[in-house]
């Protein structure tokens, strides 16, 4: 949950690619005004996930989840929260 | 804002060598089945995507990272 809060559109696109869901990918890419060549590039990546099957998608999803919830990222998220709190306090 | 570790993972997936990408994944999930899968996906992407495709994917990622939705 925390990781999706840091950049929800990135995780929308990543999981659409990894799930092999073309419709979902199109919807996500529309949100960032992707050009046709950009869509083509993402669909080539999606093809690799589809060709390698369900286990492949699950394993790569596991990698992304693990990195996103690692101390490298969680430390970053905590730091950002601290900075936000400081700014909010200064702004009052 | 996207986490730098995630950004590095995606950058290496697109522009790194298979060894570089898998070594990076291994820092987070050192399971043979996961690492073999990561290499298979990386090899597939390298074979399917032209340099132009990779540039387009990187430009899309820039849009994602700078989007208000990120």
């Amino acid at each position: 949950v925390k990781m999706a809060e840091t950049c929800p559109i990135f995780y929308d696109v990543f999981f659409a690619v990894a799930n092999g869901n073309e419709l979902l990918l199109d919807l996500s890419l529309t949100k960032v005004n992707a050009t046709e060549p950009e869509r083509t590039a993402m669909k080539k990546i999606q093809d690799c996930y589809v060709e390698n099957g369900l286990i492949s998608r699950v394993l790569d999803g596991l990698v992304m989840t693990t990195i996103s919830s690692s101390k490298d990222c969680m430390g970053e998220a905590v730091q950002n929260t601290v900075e936000d709190l400081k700014l909010n306090t200064l702004g009052r | 804002e996207i986490c730098p570790a995630v950004k590095r993972d995606v950058d290496l997936f697109l522009t790194g060598t298979p060894d570089e990408y898998v070594e990076q994944v291994a820092q987070y999930k050192a399971l043979p089945v996961v690492l073999e899968n990561a290499r298979i996906l990386k090899n597939c992407v390298d074979a399917k995507m032209t340099e132009e495709d990779k540039e387009n994917a990187l430009s899309l990622l820039d849009k994602i990272y700078t989007s208000p939705l990120c």
Partner: antibody, heavy 123, light 107 residues
Framework: QVVLVESGGGVVQPGRSLRLSCAAS????????MHWVRQAPGKGLEWVAV????????YYADSVKGRFTISRDNSNNTIYLQMNSLRAEDTAVYYC????????????????WGQGTLVTVSS | DIQMTQSPSTLSASVGDRVTITCRAS??????LAWYQQKPGKAPKLLIF???GLESGVPFRFSGSGSGTEFTLTISSLQPDDFATYYC?????????FGQGTKVEIK
């Protein structure tokens, strides 16, 4: 790019010893398990031994257990195969191979190979 | 040790042919199977791992399939550079074993 260079092969009498070396470059040596694989003249491939990325664990084929010892020097990016009590059936080209996938416990998939060094055991 | 048996031992084919090599394991190796290509006087080269995963730089005309005890390597359209000996290898155990090899020669 990954480069593996074996050396130390030659002609040796049965019962004698020989030490093979494999110098590695072009990759993060200390992250990968390393193997020796051999091929008798005109025959197929036979896995010989593996050493973990940090040298902590070693496995051997039954045919060489107790006679061969694999070791590595991560500061010099080199692995070794100490071969004792050599037999005629040990005659082969010995290849050094890098594991495809990094870190410990990874599967024995041979991603990169050296050019091989010939060991001939003959009286 | 798990025994790996390849068939045929020798295969005569022409450029453009579709070629299939079979590899059987004496017991299940799940999907932990690799294929290598070797040319005379050269070291083997990894083509495929985990049954169907193409290694970097290997052309798409090579493909692998199977699971358990029966596996195949297929070359969809044989090229002059493909005449070589092919080996399967299981890595289900930490005592990896190879098939005896299949030599693909010019008809």
């Amino acid at each position: 790019q990954v480069v593996l260079v074996e050396s130390g092969g030659g002609v040796v009498q049965p019962g004698r010893s020989l030490r093979l070396s494999c110098a590695a470059s072009g990759f993060t040596f200390s992250s990968y398990g390393m193997h020796w694989v051999r091929q008798a003249p005109g025959k197929g491939l036979e896995w010989v031994a593996v050493i973990w990325y940090d040298g902590s664990i070693k496995y051997y084929a039954d045919s060489v257990k107790g006679r061969f010892t694999i070791s590595r020097d991560n500061s010099n990016n080199t692995i070794y195969l100490q071969m004792n009590s050599l037999r005629a059936e040990d005659t082969a080209v010995y290849y050094c191979a890098r594991a495809l996938i990094p870190v410990a416990g990874t599967d024995p998939i041979f991603g990169y190979w050296g050019q091989g060094t010939l060991v001939t055991v003959s009286s | 040790d798990i025994q790996m048996t390849q068939s045929p031992s020798t295969l005569s084919a022409s450029v453009g042919d579709r070629v299939t090599i079979t590899c059987r394991a004496s017991q299940s190796v799940s999907s932990w199977l690799a294929w290598y290509q070797q040319k005379p006087g050269k070291a083997p080269k990894l083509l495929i791992f985990k049954t169907s995963g193409l290694e970097s730089g290997v052309p798409f005309r090579f493909s692998g399939s199977g699971s358990g005890t029966e596996f195949t390597l297929t070359i969809s359209s044989l090229q002059p550079d493909d005449f070589a000996t092919y080996y399967c290898q299981q890595y289900n155990t930490y005592s990896p074993t190879f098939g005896q090899g299949t030599k693909v020669e010019i008809k």
